[in-house]
């Protein structure tokens, strides 16, 4: 499958359309604080450079990989040392470690801008002016603000904002139509950046094993009525597509993806039964619909797991001979049975039964000692099960703002060193999963809360490795990919935390909080909430309470009243002395 | 600086009653929130009650329903009325308001 020129076969199989995204979206997800306009220049150059290499593979330079002529580039930027600091030096390094440089640098938290919506008229107007250009800094918006956003997904949400400005910006009442399908653009698109963004750490940060592992438990659970070899070969050509996007080689990863859509479409009928409507549709819809596809029906007459993997003289046999493709197939065959388990669960059950093996094989009557092994299962099993079952009662008690209040204030207490900002942003997140997943009948409440709490959890392991503050957030984080949960919610209140000196400042409040949205006054209520128990870390539910009570109320009389910045300087010293008082402080 | 001033401390048998009074100088308590903490030999303060700036009253889970708190405007005074008083409720119990804490007032409770 060796070209002469990579880039001209990358460019033929994309189109050019594809290909220049492709690359707006690989340099801005490197170059995050680039303007859009030097971007642009950029890949028209490196398009116009590909174009040659089409018409004469061997012109000069065609045969260099991509991240030779990406890398190079890149490093014609000016503003580079100044901009970016120290990735500058990336530019003094040969292939592959300059391109390993510039993924080491790629920022979860950018310092850039607030993305505003302007009014519905000047982006319909922008739109219609030019098309194309407002399109791409859609792409660039997004991408230099994701740098691991799945970057043919990516494709796939500028394919649906493309259609809703050409539909809604025709329409009688544009914003109507508009805004609504902005909104679920924008969730979508944060959804699924994150959920990216914990198959690129589990590739980086625990290593293809720990993704394929994911990757058999997740299929197996998809496509319960394919083969184990059907699923294997997946398994592999998924892995392949995620380490290319992870790893910055875009192209490729587009290419390869498109190519599993096609083998899976092609291979429908030892696959899944519920595929065809995926298949028929486009290239970008088709893989986004495969990625997405519920789960098949289980085959009715599947045997019981133990005659294999616990009653069979051979376990310790079959084990010895291939230990990875064994456990694959428990994982596989476990993974099947039970759509109703989260894929950590069912990774945390396929460790342990590893870890029996390896000790039972080496004893003096193996079977003797993993006979049992089932029977570990259920405390493992049980563990989340019970706390979903918790908390979905207190989110039906509380309702979603009031619950992720209570999150707040519970992952303040285990991690205070965290940045406000981050535990507001995680907290409000984990507090989602209520109106996500606890509307979901027994069977699927499991797979819905926990395996998004994963990705919620790794937003703040990402956010936090960027400025390690709390050894406790680094022991949950590196630990083990599939006990993050588990070792956050185990965590106590830190005993060891010096509470913050008491600041008035950080609860001075203005009148511009009375234009700002309910959600952003949410998160104004959720940032003093965090600070009340930075400096108060053993106050108790009832004077947070009685605080917020009394910061609501202020805000209400202070936005109602006829002069608001002196209601809020007067009233403001009295709010702060009556939560000193509350608190105790 | 505003003056607060606790009083009705003492010691009272368990089951028996007390009302404790925190005089606050040079501010009013209406419209400004106040609390009441106490702190048990060798233990850390704890919460106790708190009148919110819109009269709201939170107490502890502790003394929910045997602790009553009240307010007396011609006098600016602030009242904390314990019944059903338990040996645990053995502590000095401090008025504060105003960014301003009283220097407690003793409160024992004998078996």
């Known amino acids: 499958d060796a070209h002469k020129s990579e880039v001209a076969h990358r460019f033929k199989d994309l189109g050019e359309e594809n290909f220049k995204a492709l690359v707006l979206i690989a340099f801005a997800q490197y170059l995050q604080q680039c303007p859009f306009e030097d971007h642009v220049k950029l890949v028209n150059e490196v398009t116009e450079f590909a174009k040659t290499c089409v018409a004469d593979e061997s012109a000069e330079n065609c045969d260099k990989s991509l991240h030779t002529l990406f890398g190079d580039k890149l490093c014609t930027v000016a503003t580079l040392r100044e901009t970016y600091g120290e990735m500058a030096d990336c530019c003094a390094k040969q292939e592959p470690e300059r391109n390993e440089c510039f993924l080491q640098h790629k920022d979860d938290n950018p310092n850039l801008p607030r993305l505003v919506r302007p009014e519905v008229d000047v982006m319909c107007t922008a739109f219609h002016d030019n098309e194309e250009t407002f399109l791409k800094k859609y792409l660039y918006e997004i991408a230099r603000r994701h740098p691991y956003f799945y970057a043919p997904e990516l494709l796939f949400f500028a394919k649906r904002y493309k259609a809703a400005f050409t539909e809604c910006c025709q329409a009688a009442d544009k914003a109507a139509c508009l805004l609504p399908k902005l909104d679920e653009l924008r969730d979508e698109g944060k959804a699924s950046s994150a959920k990216q963004r914990l198959k690129c750490a589990s590739l980086q940060k625990f290593g293809e094993r720990a993704f394929k592992a994911w990757a058999v438990a997740r299929l197996s659970q998809r496509f319960p009525k394919a083969e184990f070899a059907e699923v294997s070969k997946l398994v592999t050509d998924l892995t392949k597509v995620h380490t290319e996007c992870c790893h910055g080689d875009l192209l490729e990863c587009a290419d390869d993806r498109a190519d599993l859509a096609k083998y899976i479409c092609e291979n429908q009928d030892s696959i899944s039964s519920k595929l065809k409507e995926c298949c028929e549709k486009p290239l970008l819809e088709k893989s986004h619909c495969i990625a997405e596809v519920e789960n098949d029906e289980m085959p009715a007459d599947l045997p019981s797991l133990a005659a294999d993997f616990v009653e069979s003289k051979d376990v310790c046999k079959n084990y010895a001979e291939a230990k990875d493709v064994f456990l694959g197939m428990f994982l596989y065959e476990y993974a099947r049975r039970h759509p109703d388990y989260s894929v950590v669960l069912l990774l945390r059950l396929a460790k342990t039964y590893e870890t029996t093996l390896e000790k039972c094989c080496a004893a003096a009557d193996p079977h003797e000692c993993y006979a049992k092994v089932f029977d570990e299962f259920k405390p493992l099993v049980e563990e989340p099960q019970n706390l979903i079952k918790q908390n979905c009662e207190l989110f039906e008690q509380l309702g979603e703002y009031k619950f992720q209040n209570a999150l707040l204030v519970r992952y303040t207490k285990k991690v205070p060193q965290v940045s406000t900002p981050t535990l507001v942003e995680v907290s409000r997140n984990l507090g989602k999963v209520g109106s996500k997943c606890c509307k979901h009948p027994e069977a699927k409440r499991m797979p819905c809360a926990e395996d998004y709490l994963s990705v919620v959890l790794n937003q703040l392991c990402v956010l936090h490795e960027k400025t390690p503050v709390s050894d406790r957030v680094t022991k949950c984080c590196t630990e083990s990919l599939v006990n993050r949960r588990p070792c956050f919610s185990a965590l106590e209140v830190d005993e060891t935390y010096v509470p913050k000196e008491f600041n008035a400042e950080t609860f001075t409040f203005h009148a511009d909080i009375c234009t700002l949205s309910e959600k952003e006054r949410q998160i104004k209520k959720q940032t003093a909430l965090v600070e009340l128990v930075k400096h108060k870390p053993k106050a108790t539910k009832e004077q947070l309470k009685a605080v917020m009570d009394d910061f609501a109320a202020f805000v209400e009389k202070c936005c109602k009243a006829d002069d608001k910045e002196t209601c809020f300087a007067e009233e403001g010293k009295k709010l702060v002395a009556a939560s000193q008082a509350a608190l105790g402080l | 600086q505003v003056q607060l001033v606790e009083s009705g401390g003492g010691l009272v048998q368990a089951g028996g009653t007390l009302r404790l009074s925190c005089t606050a100088s040079?501010?009013?308590?209406?419209?400004?929130?106040m609390a009441w903490h106490r702190q048990a030999p060798g233990k850390e303060r704890e919460f106790v009650a708190y009148?919110?700036?819109?009269?709201?009253?939170t107490y502890a889970e502790s003394v929910k329903g045997r602790f009553t708190l009240s307010r007396d405007d011609a006098k600016n005074r602030v009242y904390l009325h314990m019944n059903n008083l338990e040996v645990e409720d053995t502590a000095v119990y401090y008025c504060?308001?105003?960014?301003?804490w009283g220097q407690g007032t003793q409160v024992t409770v004998s078996s």
């Open positions: 040079g501010s009013t308590f209406r419209g400004n929130g």
């Open positions: 504060t308001a105003f960014g301003s």
């Open positions: 009148m919110g700036m819109t009269d709201r009253i």
